[in-house]
Interface confidence: low
């Protein structure tokens, strides 16, 4: 899968990014800052079906995802 559980030997969590994810299917969005484990920021989306996918933090698409999550959160309040 796109998310690796192996976090040893300076390896990143994300092996591949998913270019398209329906924001409605995202349950949780986690951002992992760059550090000794991985030299780049990583974004992991936990989907409502239990799967995890990685997103590119620089992708224009991700901004849309975050905005839609924020918008849906605001509507609930």
């Amino acid at each position: 899968g796109p998310v690796s559980a192996v976090l040893t030997e300076l390896r990143c969590t994300c092996l591949r990014v998913t270019l398209r994810v329906n924001p409605k299917t995202i349950g949780k969005l986690q951002v992992f800052p760059a550090g000794p484990q991985c030299s780049k920021v990583e974004v992991v989306a936990s989907l409502k079906n239990g799967k995890q996918v990685c997103l590119d933090p620089e992708a224009p698409f991700l901004k849309k995802v975050i905005q839609k999550i924020l918008d849906s959160g605001n509507k609930k309040n």
Epitope: S4, L10, V17, C54, D56, E58, A59
Partner: antibody, heavy 119, light 107 residues
């Protein structure tokens, strides 16, 4: 700074094979994908495949399955491309490149390796 | 595979002129497009990624725009160093595919 140093020009016979190397420096090799691209005069740029050394993942263009094999030695931060059953169609400049983020745009490029197939 | 139609295939322009090169994808690639400059016997150099973002060290006279299927690279004021071949690349779908290139020369 990120650098990709490729092996030199090769003159090889038809039917033989060749291995091109791409030594990476200036970044954590196992964190990024290495991409290989072919360029022939008048044919533009063509994606061959890519490799993620951190997990041993490789993906190939349908056009290069059975032609190219991508490997890496993480201890020396070097990626390799092995080409077999060479013909004149394989005469080209081959570039390695590092992805910008995972399998996305090609941020940094090697200088290219010229392969000439001739009898 | 996604086909990238790049135009023009070649063009000539004067110093200081505004130059625009376009790429059209055969389907929506959602801004997963980058632009590369290549000079003879040299490796490609990244200019723009994600359709609009300027790569490190690239002069601000270069800019990218577009969305959906249609994208463009613009040089606001042509300099002699800009004579080269320019390629677009889509990476929204696998396999990544390049445009055929635009050869830019000075008038």
């Amino acid at each position: 700074q990120v650098q990709l140093q490729q092996s030199g020009a090769e003159l090889v016979r038809p039917g033989t094979s060749v291995t091109i190397s791409c030594k990476a420096s200036g970044y954590t090799f196992t964190n990024y994908w290495i991409v290989w691209v072919k360029q022939r005069p008048g044919h533009g740029l063509e994606w061959i495949g890519d490799l993620y050394s951190g997990g041993g993942y490789t993906f190939y263009s349908e056009n290069f399955k059975g032609k190219a094999t991508l490997t890496a030695d993480t201890s020396s931060s070097t990626a390799y491309m092995h080409l077999i059953s060479l013909t004149s169609e394989d005469s080209a400049v081959y570039f390695c490149a590092r992805s910008g983020y995972d399998r996305t745009w090609f941020a940094h490029w090697g200088q290219g390796s010229l392969v000439t197939v001739s009898s | 595979d996604i086909k990238m139609t790049q135009s023009p295939s070649s063009m000539s322009a004067s110093l200081g002129e505004r130059v625009t090169i376009t790429c059209q994808a055969s389907q929506d690639i959602e801004s997963y497009l980058s632009w590369y400059q290549q000079k003879p016997w040299k490796s490609p150099k990244t200019l723009i990624y994600y359709a609009t973002r300027l790569a490190d060290g690239v002069p601000s006279r270069f800019s990218g725009s577009g969305s959906g299927q249609d994208y463009s690279l613009t040089i606001s004021s042509l300099e002699s160093d800009d004579t080269a071949t320019y390629y677009c690349l889509q990476h929204g779908e696998s396999p990544p595919t390049f445009g055929a290139g635009t050869k830019l020369e000075l008038k």
